[in-house]
Amino acid sequence: AIVFIKQPSSQDALQGRRALLRCEVEAPGLVHVYWLLDGAPVQDTERRFTQGSSLSFAAVDRLQDSGTFQCVARDDVTGEEARSANASFNIKWIEAGPVVLKHPASEAEIQPQTQVTLRCHIDGHPRPTYQWFRDGTPLSDGQSNNTVSSKERNLTLRPAGPEHSGLYSCCAHNAFGQACSSQNFTLSIADESFARVVLAPQDVIVARNEEAMFHCQFSAQPPPNLQWLFEDETPITNRSRPPHLRRATVFANGSLLLTQVRPRNAGVYRCIGQGQRGPPVILEATLHLAEIEDMPLFEPRVFTAGSEERVTCLPPKGLPEPSVWWEHAGVRLPTHGRVYQKGHELVLASIAESDAGVYTCHAANLAGQRRQDVNITVATVPTWLKKPQDSQLEEGKPGYLHCLTQATPKPTVVWYRNQMLISEDSRFEVFKNGTLRINNVEVYDGTWYRCVSSTPAGSIEAQARVQVLEKLKFTPPPQPQQCMEFDKEATVPCSATGREKPTIKWERADGSSLPEWVTDNAGTLHFARVTRDDAGNYTCIASNGPQGQIRAHVQLTVAVFITFKVEPERTTVYQGHTALLQCEAQGDPKPLIQWKGKDRILDPTKLGPRMHIFQNGSLVIHDVAPEDSGRYTCIAGNSCNIKHTEAPLYVVDKPVPEESEGPGSPPPYKMIQT
């Protein structure tokens, strides 16, 4: 037989807290235990579940756990079944609710001297005890002409007067705990002698020169006084109007009319109602002058076909806030479709080429209307008008490569040379139409060129090979003036290139033949031993079959190269004495001497009184100072060559002679004494 060792028992429970209904069985066979609630099987949930044979509650729920629980044990083999005693929960709970008006039926019916009943909608088990509050202060039974039943949830005020006005709240407690009203009730019972607002003035916005009307009404017994004031507290009456409110009229019903409104009329207007008793009631309303600012400019927009784009129209600042709408081709855009307005935005869904054009954003209010156009371009992928073609360009001449395309907007064209972007410089120029001009074609310009034409919609590209057609030219051009050293061997080179290897020949400009000691060997003029007669004008002629011939004229000078007869020496001079740096050079043509001191050329015309360069080339510095110290370079030059030699100059303090030294003892260095 199945025996219950522990049976569930009825118990107190708290809403939302844990609980356990125990059940333990003993039986010879294998039994399984389940629970019934009001006769129906209990399904396990996270909140309520079987734990062994017992039923565990993670959080008791007053609604779902009310009823009779029973533990059932069943032997599935024999079919024997045993049921426990019934058990139930006494669930304690409390739940907040609002304070509501029970009597009269609506707030509008509350009049002085009528009975008012408020109900506290806090519920619980066991039944709570209630406490009422006005403006946060507890109310006790019989206090100030009210009847309070703490057992009841009702508060009755009989009769209700202005002194009962306030914010009513309630709290309640029971064995579970305490709760206060979730929503309170404001009771307002006016004193009829107090001014009460019937109609309050509203802020108004008017356009300049239009009229503005403020309505204001109070009620009281006896009827209240009504007065209008403008910003500076100046009263406005039909008899005494302030100077800036000449066009103001106060009507018998309290309304204030302002005609032909000006900017100075804008401001705060106060309507004051004063009853026989009570404080004045001040109502304010502002008169705004309508205004609308200019709209910001739109940048032109470029969109690609098929995309979705939005253009936001920033409404201009204005009072009242301007309304905004978009138009295209004079027609207001709808609020849905493929091209439509959404809020302040112009929306173009799946853009088509036909959507291109001018769209206008309009903004308007009482002050007027503003508009701003936006130009929308629908970009297309460029198409070819003329692709770059493989070209043969002549060296030294301008060359052109074309890249003509068309698209919307006008495509931008960039050129690449050997995959490197061509930046415009003195040699490369890209015209507006995309044509590349190479200003002075050089041999190494023979390579691949690629142009890319782009719009926001896409790009196209093409490449072309440039072959440079070499001109017949000297490489390098011979120097037009050259010097040869007398009685020495000399060579004058001349080389040229062309489409075909040129033949090179030297001749004397006077047409006379070259002497036997002068040979012309593959373009190099060779002088075995230069004589005076070798000086003169020579012509190098380069020629080939297809390109003809070119000439270069060279004037050869025979010279005796420069040598120094006298070179300046390392010199030390006492401060205040005179320094002499000697330099003499010889050569033919006769060389000129120049001096360089402290890294600057000494200009004989600007030397000043202390320095002088003699005819023979020597440099004299009088009254030397320490700053004259340094390296001095003698430069000898003629039309044929230039040579230089240098020496340091040291300026030292004159030592004080010691007793042991005789007057004739020499200084330890080469010294010029003057």
């Epitope: 489409r499 075909e500 002629i541 079959g545 297809p546 003809g548 011939q549």
Partner: antibody
């Protein structure tokens, strides 16, 4: 004006040689190459070679190599073309032409009036 | 050597006609092509040099165009004195070579 004047017509026996002259005037003779071009009766133009009056350098067409000699005399601004071992196939009008140029390329202008050489036994 | 091929070899046309002669090179010769006119019993006369430059004294009805391997000589309105043989010649490389000629005859 620039002019090239050639020597008169010649009749030669097969195996003989012919020397045609071309006198230049109106420009600096040594500045331009002289080319020789021949035209057989009813045929097209055939290039024979050139001479540089300045250097005396020559360049002959492969076909005439060893049979043609081009010379010049700068003192009388005259160029010569001599063709040896004549055969009847050499019957043609022989033209000299100045080679004008611009450093990139060139063209024949002007041409001599032509010299008819007839080779007949 | 560069081969020059002219077409047609001959053509018949009337005074006032537009005539076009083409010349093709066996390899690219850039723009280095010249055109000559030869009347019977006369030496050739230069018409066009470097493909499109008109020699001074030549009427403007003669125009040349082309580059690379394909070139054309056009006579916009044929005149009686234009009936002759026309030759193209390349001066791109040595040896200079001529086309076989195009004879323009009176129709």
């Amino acid at each position: 004006q620039v002019q090239l004047v050639q020597s008169g017509a010649e009749v030669k026996k097969p195996g003989a040689s012919v020397k045609v002259s071309c006198r230049a005037s109106g420009y600096t003779f040594t500045d331009y190459f002289i080319h020789w071009v021949r035209q057989a009766p009813g045929q097209g133009l055939e290039w024979m070679g050139w001479i540089s009056p300045n250097s005396g350098g020559t360049n002959y067409a492969q076909k005439f190599q060893g049979r043609v000699t081009m010379t010049r005399d700068t003192s009388i601004t005259t160029a010569y073309m001599e063709l040896s071992s004549l055969t009847s196939d050499d019957t043609a009008v022989y033209y000299c032409a100045r080679y004008d140029y611009d450093g990139y390329s060139g063209w024949f202008d002007p041409w001599g009036q032509g010299t008819l050489v007839t080779v007949s036994s | 050597d560069i081969q020059m091929t002219q077409s047609p070899s001959s053509l018949s046309a009337s005074v006032g006609d537009r005539v076009t002669i083409t010349c093709r090179a066996s390899q690219s010769i850039a723009i280095y092509l010249n055109w000559y006119q030869q009347r019977p019993g006369k030496p050739p006369k230069l018409l066009i040099f470097t493909a499109s430059s008109l020699q001074s004294g030549v009427p403007s009805r003669f125009t040349g165009s082309g580059s690379g391997t394909d070139f054309t000589l056009s006579i916009s309105s044929l005149q009686p004195e234009d009936f002759a043989t026309y030759y193209c010649q390349q001066s791109y490389s040595t040896p200079p070579t001529f086309g076989q000629g195009t004879k323009v005859e009176i129709k």
